[in-house]
C-alpha cells in the first residue's frame, strides 16, 4: 500500500530545560511556547519541497 | 532534561532517513543560537504504516 | 558537461599513505553530494563514504573510518581521499561518484577509478 | 547495518530472452533502490533510480520494480551489447551497501 507519504518517528533531548507537569498540559504557556518553537525549528530545517509537516509531539522526562 | 518525541511527514521518495537524521543534526548549533535549545541524543526511525489513527502531517 | 577525472594509478608500499584527488568540471562543485567506492580486483562494490563540498560535512561507513579521509578543496573544484596504512587488502580501484541533487538518491555521474596497488 | 542479497551471482543467456535479477534487502528500503551496470574495464553507470525509475538514455527494453525488501531488474529482450555486471544499491540508510553483483553472459 503506497500512500505517497513518508513518516519518521524522531527523539530528542533538549538538555537545557527542565520538564515540570505543565508539558504534560497542551493548554499551558509552557507547552505551547515549546511546541511553537519546535514547529518553526523544523520547517527551517526541512526547508525543501519535501516536508509536509510534523503531528503527535509528545514531551517527556528526560 | 526534556525528551521530545514527534513524527514527519515527507512526500515519498523525497528524503530517506539518513538525510533526515543528518540535516536535523547539523541544525543543532542554530537551534541553540536561535531557540536557546541545547540538543543533544537524536535518534530518527522510520514509521511502519499505518502507525497510528492519528497521523496526520500538520 | 559534468566530467570527474581521477588521478593516476598508485603503487605503494605496506604501511604508506596515499591520496586520490577527483576533479569536478561541468557543474557547481559545492551543491553535489561526492561518494567514494572500492573495487578490490574481480570484487564487487563496497561504499565508503561521502562528502559535501559546500559544508565539508563527511560521513563515512564504519568500517572505513580509521582507513579514508574524506577532503575537498573548493576553489579547485576536487575532493580527495587519502588512505592510511595502506595494507595488501587495500589494493583496489577506487572511484569517486557524485550525487544527484535535490532528492536524487543515486550515483548519476562517476568517475574513471583510480587503481591503488599496495605491495612490497 | 542493510544487507543487500542479489541473485543470481551470474547468469547466462540468449540474445532476446527475458532476463530477471532480484535484489533482497534485510530491511524495508523504501524504494531507495538503485540498480548500475558496469561493463568489464570501466566504471559503473545508473540504470535505474527510486526502483523503477529509468535514468535519460537507458533503453527501455530494462525496467526495474519492487517494494519494501524485494526488488528486480529485467531485461525484456537481452541485446549482445547488456553483458555486464549488475549492481543493486540501498540508498535508504547508511552504510549505503551494494549487492554483491550480478554477472550477465550471452550463451
Known amino acids: 500500500l503506497s500512500t505517497g507519504v513518508s513518516f519518521f518517528f524522531l527523539s530528542f533531548h533538549i538538555s537545557n530545560l527542565q520538564f515540570n507537569s505543565s508539558l504534560e498540559d497542551p493548554s499551558t504557556d509552557y507547552y505551547q511556547e515549546l511546541q511553537r518553537d519546535i514547529s518553526e525549528m523544523f520547517l527551517q530545517i526541512y526547508k525543501q519541497g519535501g516536508f509536509l509537516g510534523l503531528s503527535n509531539i509528545k514531551f517527556r522526562p528526560g | 532534561s526534556v525528551v521530545v518525541q514527534l513524527t514527519l511527514a515527507f512526500r515519498e521518495g523525497t528524503i530517506n532517513v539518513h538525510d533526515v537524521e543528518t540535516q536535523f543534526n547539523q541544525y543543532k548549533t542554530e537551534a541553540a543560537s536561535r531557540y536557546n535549545l541545547t540538543i543533544s541524543d537524536v535518534s530518527v526511525s522510520d514509521v511502519p504504516f499505518p502507525f497510528s489513527a492519528q497521523s496526520g502531517a500538520g | 558537461q559534468v566530467q570527474l577525472v581521477q588521478s593516476g594509478a598508485e603503487v605503494k608500499k605496506p604501511g604508506a599513505s596515499v591520496k586520490v584527488s577527483c576533479k569536478a568540471s561541468g557543474y557547481t562543485f559545492t551543491t553535489y553530494t561526492m561518494h567514494w567506492i572500492k573495487q578490490a580486483p574481480g570484487q564487487g562494490l563496497e561504499w565508503i563514504g561521502y562528502i559535501n563540498p559546500g559544508s565539508d560535512y563527511t560521513h563515512y561507513n564504519q568500517k572505513f573510518k580509521d582507513k579514508a579521509t574524506l577532503t575537498a578543496d573548493k576553489s579547485a573544484s576536487t575532493a580527495y581521499m587519502e588512505l592510511s596504512s595502506l595494507r595488501s587488502e587495500d589494493t583496489a580501484v577506487y572511484y569517486c561518484?557524485?550525487?544527484?541533487?535535490?532528492?536524487?538518491?543515486?550515483?548519476?555521474?562517476w568517475g574513471q577509478g583510480t587503481l591503488v596497488t599496495v605491495s612490497s | 547495518d542493510i544487507q543487500m542479497t542479489q541473485s543470481p551471482s551470474s547468469l547466462s543467456a540468449s540474445v532476446g530472452d527475458r532476463v530477471t535479477i532480484t535484489c533482497r534487502a534485510s530491511g524495508n528500503i523504501h524504494n531507495f533502490l538503485v540498480w548500475y551496470q558496469q561493463k568489464p574495464g570501466k566504471s559503473p553507470k545508473l540504470l535505474v533510480y527510486n526502483a523503477k525509475t529509468l535514468t535519460d538514455g537507458v533503453p527501455s527494453r530494462f525496467s526495474g520494480s519492487g517494494s519494501g525488501t524485494q526488488y528486480s531488474l529485467t531485461i525484456s529482450s537481452l541485446q549482445p551489447e547488456d553483458v555486464a555486471t549488475y549492481y543493486c544499491q540501498n540508498f535508504w540508510n547508511v552504510p549505503f551497501t551494494f549487492g554483491s553483483g550480478t554477472k550477465l553472459e550471452i550463451k
Open positions: 561518484a557524485r550525487q544527484g541533487n535535490y532528492a536524487a538518491y543515486y550515483f548519476d555521474y
